[in-house]
Interface confidence: medium
Amino acid sequence: LVVTPPGPELVLNVSSTFVLTCSGSAPVVWERMSQEPPQEMAKAQDGTFSSVLTLTNLTGLDTGEYFCTHNDSRGLETDERKRLYIFVPDPTVGFLPNDAEELFIFLTEITEITIPCRVTDPQLVVTLHEKKGDVALPVPYDHQRGFSGIFEDRSYICKTTIGDREVDSDAYYVYRLQVSSINVSVNAVQTVVRQGENITLMCIVIGNEVVNFEWTYPRKESGRLVEPVTDFLLDMPYHIRSILHIPSAELEDSGTYTCNVTESVNDHQDEKAINITVVESGYVRLLGEVGTLQFAELHRSRTLQVVFEAYPPPTVLWFKDNRTLGDSSAGEIALSTRNVSETRYVSELTLVRVKVAEAGHYTMRAFHEDAEVQLSFQLQINVPVRVLELSESHPDSGEQTVRCRGRGMPQPNIIWSACRDLKRCPRELPPTLLGNSSEEESQLETNVTYWEEEQEFEVVSTLRLQHVDRPLSVRCTLRNAVGQDTQEVIVVPHSLPFKV
């Protein structure tokens, strides 16, 4: 933004006319006292935007701040705004006028404040006085802002001399506001109730002897008043309690309940509010998703968690294959449902050192007299693979076969590999993968069986080798999601009299 003349402070003659120009790369506007005075806006051929503010027949009342700002950036950082301060010395204007409220300066702590008495002429000497005193106070004065410093709770006036005339400003009142010393807390027996149940709220004040309670609540707005009960908590000094009890709540009793407490000696006050919800009937709602297929690893512990909201408190049952589960005495299963907030619950099923037999269909059911919800999932027990057998044989057909058998859950993949150079394999040479597409003259036949009782897959794979002309290291590797296992056998040609 470019302002002409640049300022930052100008002194102009009374009754004169003056032109202010502001230009920028985006639309610009002049502001005076948060308003936009009449101005001429234009856009040049080179894409520059400008605004011209013509000040005519200037008076002392034109003294003050002028801002040029991008039209769409009001309220942004100061580098998006150019400030200009104009003085128009005018002997007919003493101190610049104030809004009545500007004459009050409110404080809550000891801090520097500004008494904003301003004059039209930067050459004038301005002094600050207590309203009832003649002595000038040693406080620095800024002609653009006023007197800044730390002030007592008093009334102050500013004085200046214009020609041979002494001029006083309006009185400014510095008010230190009271900070409430009341400590109020509000709580409810429950913030969610069913229609027909009771709403009971308590408002407690600590450390004050003489207080007045005022409750605001939805029923009050419709003219149906409820008389609160106030008592003292005898075991605690100066703990005063007001109880608001609404029997047989209606849906319209939902809303904000506010306890306003006034302390009559120092006239302090504080208020706290709480929201109450009245529901037509109870509810149970699942929160979040639980997949229909869950996994656990054999011999490891696994916790399955369900989060839900409910009111009133529900009964929670867990089932496996339609049979009710309970905490087992052997400590193999642990069930817990805990209340994490007034209406939110977490129910957990923990299987300790999971066994194959614990695979199956699990259901959690949460219910009360008004509603119920259930969540089901299948639990699969993952079993790391094991190679149970790796054997080599010489059928009469002349070919040589290697048979690999293994088990695991989920279904294992089988990988065959071979190595011809026994000395360098597998440390230096990578083994060659075998199979139907391998360069080896080999054939592969794999069968998979699912054993229901053990809840795992068995893989049997037979590798047929057509021509084995020198010793060969054959490796069978089984892999699944939870592990892998490998065994190795040395296959020797028929002609050789030994086997390793």
């Epitope: 409110f106 809550t108 009271q178 900070v179 409430s180 005022e214 306003n260 006034t262 006239d267 006050q269």
Partner: nanobody, 118 residues
Framework: EVQLVESGGGLVQAGGSARLSCAAS????????MAWSRQAPGKQREVVAL???????TYATSVKGRFTISRDDAKNTVYLQMNSLKPEDTNLYTC????????????WGQGTQVTVSS
């Protein structure tokens, strides 16, 4: 909560007088201030007169000497006596209440229209 109800506005001849009243009800705390403000279209709201419960009164320069603010704390009511009215005093006059304490909020009435005809 504090409720404010203004009355007394209407049509007045230039040079004439009007008296506005504002009655406060609800949680009235002391000390407090009560004020009268006005807002012309396209202008900032201007507080023209203000009175505190401990007896301080102040006025905007534009109304000083013509308007007088007074209070009746027994009735929780503030008055604005408007004399020597000018056409530029035409406005919606709104009453405000604020407790003089930290964190207190301003409560405003609905306003009463004063129209000064020339």
């Amino acid at each position: 909560e504090v409720q404010l109800v203004e009355s007394g506005g209407g049509l007045v001849q230039a040079g004439g007088s009007a008296r506005l009243s504002c009655a406060a009800s609800g949680s009235i705390l002391s000390p407090n201030l009560m004020a009268w403000s006005r807002q012309a279209p396209g202008k900032q709201r201007e507080v023209v007169a203000l009175a505190t419960s401990d007896g301080i009164t102040t006025y905007a320069t534009s109304v000083k000497g013509r308007f007088t603010i007074s209070r009746d704390d027994a009735k929780n009511t503030v008055y604005l006596q408007m004399n020597s009215l000018k056409p530029e005093d035409t406005n919606l006059y709104t009453c405000k209440y604020r407790a003089l304490r930290a964190g207190a909020v301003d409560y405003w009435g609905q306003g009463t229209q004063v129209t000064v005809s020339s």
